[in-house]
């Protein structure tokens, strides 16, 4: 969960407890198990590149 | 350019613990994933467990839950594994790896492994 | 937790000739993204463990376009088009796809 008095993610992105910030939707990509990627299933990601494990 | 060096070979009596050290250069330590992985002689690679630097936070393989404790430390952007309760089981290289969670990632990176001998 | 296992455990290489090391999976690692999460390491003789081929079919930087790889959901394949010496050492399939992270049990290549 976010946490209080956080301002809210932008748009394409969702927040990370793993990394204590917000996180772009596209990383999901890379790694679809992060704990942010829950955030980002409702919302397409922004533009992104091939990735790295 | 990015480099993870691992700290030098151990022997050790089993029962006793040792710490392994991962220092990372060349980039942002907060901002990736150390994992930690176990290649006991002849043997091929098994994942010991990960760690979030940044935040501490942790995730283990069942396997390894109560042998292995990871930290790290921020200030000197060093990764830490520390194995309990040592037995001769637990003879292996072990080696640390950055993981990433981005998705403009350029490759990934292993240190150089530590050999760790346990024996009476 | 996923299992990787690969065949065959032992590869006897002729340098120029090519060769072929396959892996399946005990589950689909195609995503519901597109993405199919299987990736490809050497680990050289001595050496750590390098990557050679991400996301299935992706070579990493650096990385001779002699290797290349493809396969399905759960049926994967490394193929080396024409072996160099340089190429020996175990070769691993692991997956990204959750956690546990878990590897094959590595196939080892060497020269005839």
């Known amino acids: 969960e976010q946490a209080p008095g956080t301002a809210p993610c932008s748009r394409g992105s969702s927040w990370s407890a793993d990394l204590d910030k917000c996180m772009d939707c596209a990383s999901c990509r890379a790694r679809p198990h992060s704990d942010f990627c829950l955030g980002c299933a409702a919302a397409p990601p922004a533009p992104f590149r091939l990735l790295w494990p | 350019q990015v480099q993870l060096v691992q700290s030098g070979a151990e022997v050790k009596k089993p029962g006793a613990s040792v710490k392994v050290s991962c220092k990372a250069s060349g980039y942002t330590f907060t901002d990736f994933i150390i994992a930690w992985v176990k290649q006991a002689p002849g043997q091929g690679l098994e994942w010991i467990g990960e760690i979030y630097p940044g935040t501490g936070r942790t995730y283990y393989s069942e396997k390894f839950r109560g042998k292995a404790t990871l930290t790290a430390d921020t200030s000197t952007s060093t990764a830490y594994m520390e194995l309990s309760s040592l037995r001769s089981e637990d003879t292996a290289v072990y080696f640390c790896?950055?993981?990433?969670?981005?998705?403009?990632?350029?490759?990934?990176?292993w240190g150089q492994g530590t050999l760790v001998t346990v024996s009476s | 937790d996923i299992v990787m296992t690969q065949s065959p455990l032992s590869l006897p290489v002729t340098p120029g000739e090519p060769a072929s090391i396959s892996c399946r999976s005990s589950q689909s690692l195609l995503h519901s993204n597109g993405i199919t999460y299987l990736y490809w390491y050497l680990q050289k003789p001595g050496q750590s463990p390098q990557l050679l081929i991400y996301?299935?079919?992706n070579r990493a930087s650096g990385v001779p376009d002699r290797f290349s790889g493809s396969g399905s959901g759960t049926d994967f394949t490394l193929k080396i088009s024409r072996v160099e010496a340089e190429d020996v050492g175990v070769y691993y399939c692991a997956h990204n796809l959750e956690l546990p992270w878990t590897f094959g049990q590595g196939t080892k290549v060497e020269i005839k």
């Open positions: 790896a950055r993981r990433t969670i981005y998705y403009d990632y350029d490759g990934d990176y």
């Open positions: 996301q299935m079919s």
